[in-house]
């Protein structure tokens, strides 16, 4: 059971966290583009992991970490001080209807993106589901062409909200279908900014 | 080339910028409703252009520009100082399935809304894709009524994220289907607010 | 990270996350409300439960957020809808889902839509389905303004703290 969240193919959010939080570094130095040294903030962009995983990049393209914000593959995004944070996430998905036609129900897929909190003052126990979004997609098939895959479909699942975090707590993204993530530029990201 | 974005009817994001950034003025005076003179911020609301284009309104209804933020049809939204900005966009879309039935693939449309950066310290070259959302819609038809258009469908494509911008850089929205934009109040907007 | 699940009720008792005691100088007007899961056929906003809160002047009255001071606010809201497929023989009409954040102000004699999303769902074509709507934007608000929501498809809401929420914070 997924901690009161939406149904997902990934029953164990912790397991997905291990898979989905790879590919990163703790910033030993701030990126040169850091224009706001006083503000804990981060914007991480989705990057594929080998084996159909979702990882996060902290330095390429628009990604950055500021003011002691840290990210590691195993532990997620750690904010450096207590405060009120606006957390946000967008995951782009893409796919095709499988070949063979059949009834639409068998083709439906429910895509889910969720943001969890773990560790710190919250304790080492079960991750806590903070925010999540979902979308059910039913890809179409050409009835006349029952052999091949259907056309590409795209969707995005995003959300954002205020969360009070303590230093040492970590936030991370869990997704239901890492094999369907769209890693094209600008499509998949998550981040945080301290607002109070 | 669309910089990693989805295929769009507008192959050249710069050209779409010209089309999609109309309907504006540079604010010679700040709107009287500017309640936060120290904070660069803007909220622009979608407004139709002649010829099925998407323009942006800077003063009507809830739209505003503050603290030296400027908007022009040709160049987009210019932020007055270096900093960390939360950029956001939501585009509502609406349409009907075309008459005549046919296969579902032919009815599918992938709606895309994208936010680009250009100019300033980033350089005068190719616009840079910052954030993007997408949604594939397959309108349904009433099988018993093959003559007329299908029922209205609605969807929204939105996103928001942190971007480090420098003074003189400009951000603008590019969309794939300006003819399908829903201009009802609250449906289509983009904006920026400096958070650090 | 451990992945042991909790039932929602157990989760609520296990997750009493203490309120922040931030230095007063850093406090800004802010609010994050969640849909009351005990009210299944209406959308009632709750504060002071789970991760919901009202901070530095925000108040909740008649299911509306009252803006404490004039300024620019980032306002956001999300809903998640769900439903079951109808039987294959049933001719299901499309289901209209919508969610809107509205402003009621002394400057306007009516509710003004600030953020609005809508969607048509065709349940007959699908298995159990989920659809989320999130939107957020910056607005210039005046002290005393009221922010409220209007939702079509309330019986289909997935009322949990992570899925249905409404908030604002001063910038």
């Amino acid at each position: 059971q997924d901690q009161g969240g939406l149904v997902t193919e990934t029953a164990d959010p912790g397991a997905q966290a291990q898979q989905g939080l790879g590919f990163q570094k703790l910033p030993e130095e701030e990126p040169e583009t850091d224009l706001s040294p006083g503000l804990p903030a981060a914007h991480l962009i989705g990057a594929p992991l080998k084996g159909q995983g979702l990882g996060w990049e902290t330095t390429k393209e628009q990604a950055f970490l500021t003011s002691g914000t840290q990210f590691s593959d195993a532990e997620g995004l750690a904010l450096p001080q207590d405060g009120l944070y606006y957390l946000y996430c967008l995951v782009g998905y893409r796919g095709r209807a499988p070949p063979g036609g059949g009834d639409p129900q068998g083709r439906s897929v429910t895509l889910r993106s969720s943001l969890y909190r773990a560790g710190g003052a919250y304790g080492p126990g079960t991750p806590e589901l903070l925010l999540e979004g979902a979308e059910t997609v039913t890809p179409v098939l050409d009835p006349a062409r029952r052999q091949g895959y259907g056309p590409l479909w795209y969707t995005s699942v995003g959300f954002g909200g205020l969360v009070q975090l303590r230093r040492g707590e970590r936030v991370y993204v869990n997704i239901s279908h890492p094999d369907m993530v769209d890693f094209a530029r600008g499509k998949t990201f998550f981040g945080a900014v301290m607002v109070g | 080339q669309d910089q990693g974005g989805l295929v769009t009817e507008t192959a050249d994001p710069g050209a779409q910028a010209q089309q999609g950034l109309g309907f504006q003025k540079l604010p010679e005076e700040e709107p009287e409703t500017d309640l936060s003179p120290g904070l660069p911020a803007a909220h622009l609301i979608g407004a139709p252009l002649k010829g099925q284009g998407l323009g942006w309104e800077t003063t009507k209804e809830q739209a505003f520009l503050t603290s030296g933020t400027q908007f022009s049809d040709a160049e987009g939204l210019a932020l007055p100082q270096d900093g960390l900005y939360y950029l956001y966009c939501l585009v509502g879309y609406r349409g009907r399935a075309p008459p005549g039935g046919g296969d579902p693939q032919g009815r599918s449309v992938t709606l895309r809304s994208s936010l680009y950066r250009a100019g300033g310290a980033y350089g005068p070259g190719t616009p840079e894709l910052l954030l993007e959302g997408a949604e594939t819609v397959t309108p349904v038809l009433d099988p018993a009524r093959r003559q007329g258009y299908g029922p209205l469908w609605y969807t929204s494509v939105g996103f928001g994220g942190l971007v480090q911008l420098r003074r003189g850089e400009r951000v603008y929205v590019n969309i794939s289907h300006p003819d399908m934009v829903d201009f009802a109040r609250g449906k289509t907007f983009f904006g920026a607010v400096m958070v650090g | 990270l451990p992945g042991v699940g909790l039932t929602p009720s157990a989760a609520q008792t296990a997750r009493q996350h203490p309120k922040m005691h931030l230095a007063h100088s850093t406090l800004k007007p802010a609010a994050h409300l969640i849909g009351d899961p005990s009210k299944q056929n209406s959308l009632l906003w709750r504060a002071n439960t789970d991760r919901a809160f009202l901070q530095d002047g925000f108040s909740l009255s008649n299911n509306s957020l009252l803006v404490p001071t004039s300024g620019i606010y980032f306002v956001y809201s999300q809903v998640v809808f769900s439903g079951k497929a109808y039987s294959p023989k049933a001719t299901s009409s499309p289901l209209y889902l919508a969610h809107e954040v509205q402003l009621f102000s002394s400057q306007y004699p009516f509710h003004v839509p600030l953020l609005s999303s809508q969607k048509m769902v065709y349940p007959g074509l699908q298995e159990p389905w989920l659809h989320s709507m999130y939107h957020g934007a910056a607005f210039q608000l005046t002290q005393g303004d009221q922010l409220s929501t209007h939702t079509d498809g309330i019986p289909h809401l997935v009322l949990s703290p992570s899925t249905v929420f409404f908030g604002a914070f001063a910038l």
Partner: antibody, heavy 118, light 111 residues
Framework: DVQLQESGPGLVKPSQSLSLTCSVT?????????WNWIRQFPGNKLEGMGY???????NYNPSLKNRISITRDSSKNQFFLKLNSVTAEDSGTYYC???????????WGQGTSVTVSS | DIVLTQSPASLAVSLGQRATISCRAS??????????MHWYQQKPGQPPKLLIY???NLESGIPARFSGSGSRTDFTLTINPVETDDVATFYC?????????FGGGTKLEIK
């Protein structure tokens, strides 16, 4: 800044084992990315030999069969190449590199020249 | 293994002119909506240096004279205008499937 530096013997006898070390500074090899060995033959052809992942898993080029092993010492922030049963065809310049997968190999060592000769 | 075929093997271009290098893959290197194709520049005695990642994205610090394009199996590196400092060998590399493979290289000279 992230830096990689190869070290090891420049001359190895045929049938013996080649052992090289890559020392990484400015970044923890257990925090992320994939840590590769690439070699360049005298005719300038480049060959990916294999990598060790941030999580310790390995992948090797099948052309090297069972001759190759890539390991790491997390405490020293180093990873290692061992190539058994070398022949003259294994001569060349050996590079270690950080691989960001979809972002390419963004940091390389300067390379170390290896000659297999009796 | 995915075979990458570069052409031409060598190229002589006048200063200020455009240089175009092609790389063809034996099978598609696209996945997850992106192309796992990268371009490197190597000067004598130095390691390869990343220029372009994901087929068309300029690596940080690389001049905008370099650009990349293509998808699936056909990719192009363009240098425009060519400068003296560009004399080097250029390689394409795919990371979509293990083992990683490189093209045979294109040597750029100034006319």
């Amino acid at each position: 800044d992230v830096q990689l530096q190869e070290s090891g013997p420049g001359l190895v006898k045929p049938s013996q084992s080649l052992s090289l070390t890559c020392s990484v500074t400015g970044y923890s090899i257990t925090s992320g990315y994939y840590w590769n060995w690439i070699r360049q033959f005298p005719g300038n052809k480049l060959e990916g030999m294999g990598y060790i992942s941030y999580d310790g898993s390995n992948n090797y080029n099948p052309s090297l069969k069972n001759r190759i092993s890539i390991t790491r010492d997390s405490s020293k922030n180093q990873f290692f190449l061992k190539l058994n049963s070398v022949t003259a065809e294994d001569s060349g310049t050996y590079y270690c590199a950080r691989d960001a997968y979809s972002y390419g190999m963004d940091y390389w060592g300067q390379g170390t020249s290896v000659t297999v000769s009796s | 293994d995915i075979v990458l075929t570069q052409s031409p093997a060598s190229l002589a271009v006048s200063l200020g002119q455009r240089a175009t290098i092609s790389c063809r893959a034996s099978e598609s290197v696209d996945n997850y909506g992106i192309s796992f194709m990268h371009w490197y520049q190597q000067k004598p005695g130095q390691p390869p240096k990343l220029l372009i990642y994901r087929a068309s994205n300029l690596e940080s610090g690389i001049p905008a004279r370099f650009s990349g394009s293509g998808s699936r199996t056909d990719f192009t590196l363009t240098i425009n205008p060519v400068e003296t400092d560009d004399v080097a060998t250029f390689y394409c590399q795919q990371s979509n499937k293990d083992p990683y493979t490189f093209g045979g290289g294109t040597k750029l000279e100034i006319k």
